[in-house]
Amino acid sequence: EPPTACREKQYLINSQCCSLCQPGQKLVSDCTEFTETECLPCGESEFLDTWNRETHCHQHKYCDPNLGLRVQQKGTSETDTICTCEEGWHCTSEACESCVLHRSCSPGFGVKQIATGVSDTICEPCPVGFFSNVSSAFEKCHPWTSCETKDLVVQQAGTNKTDVVCGPQDRLRA
């Protein structure tokens, strides 16, 4: 009676249970009544990560520097290459299939949270009393200069993009 189902790590072909190829190897020929399954190791830069009956190994993933990617872990015959983002870039999704440059915070905004490899820069508007006059992925909002502590007075008010301008106090005329 020919089998209708096979054991784990086997597959059914021509009414016969054949052994699957182990990870790192591809199928060359199915087993027969007289021969075992024939498997061959995957070539350089190829892999198969499961017990399989694939006739071709998969190419290792290419960590494309044009997409901000670099190799985190080199692939083997049984594992794929793992990519991560270059310094200054972060993943566009959890799967990290591509990266983008960290965003800079525009003038009038400061960095609330510096970016990581998986999350972008978080910016916040500079509140009253603070300013940022640069586009930066690192700079926080800076407090306006305190003219009083320098024995000066405010000659020009500050904004969210500019510091106050201090000047000497008007001398009282005699």
Partner: antibody
Framework: EVTVKESGPVLVKPTETLTLTCTVS????????VSWIRQPPGKALEWLGG???????YYASWAKSRLTISRDTNLKQVVLTMTNMDPVDTATYYC??????????WGQGTLVTVSS | AFQLTQSPSSLSASVGDRVTITCQAS??????LAWYQQKPGKPPKLLIV???NLASGVPSRFSGSGSGTDFTLTISSLQPEDFATYYC??????????FGGGTKVEIK
Amino acid sequence: EVTVKESGPVLVKPTETLTLTCTVSGFSLSSYGVSWIRQPPGKALEWLGGIGSDGSAYYASWAKSRLTISRDTNLKQVVLTMTNMDPVDTATYYCARGGITVYAMWGQGTLVTVSS
Amino acid sequence: AFQLTQSPSSLSASVGDRVTITCQASQSISSGLAWYQQKPGKPPKLLIVGASNLASGVPSRFSGSGSGTDFTLTISSLQPEDFATYYCQSYFSSSSTVFGGGTKVEIK
């Protein structure tokens, strides 16, 4: 050889559910995501959604309520289900390798017509 | 909702012309922009990734520039095989994965 190929019905009636399958070869769905993009006749490309290599599904905000994208890594298939089809959904539906990324590898596309 | 606005929607040009297509994002997408070329009855072909990097096998007459919200695709000297429709695509995040409306480049 790395390929992606769409299959499914060419004609769907209004209000029916569309099910399209993207069968991949030459790469593992555990290594790469797959996205669905459509193009109505004479119009622009529209990203519908995708599934990442980690199995996370993503959808265009306008299509979220009607779409489901799932995968079977063993069968090497990604399935798009779109409910409540309307004549305005008539389009060429493409699958492409990649989740939230760029798409260097596309299928030839399958034209789906919605008509009673 | 996030939008990518491409302009012009069509243009007429001659072989040898310098052609410029722009794409504007409704919010910053950093460097997360790609450009594609599509010919009738065919799937799109990837030209530019990361806003300015040429995809594999793409001729050097194509170039991309920009970051944040404003991006440009330039064809330095238009060739007969370049008459096609061009699309920009953002991939900054899942909520901003969108294609532009397309630019059809026709023979003058």
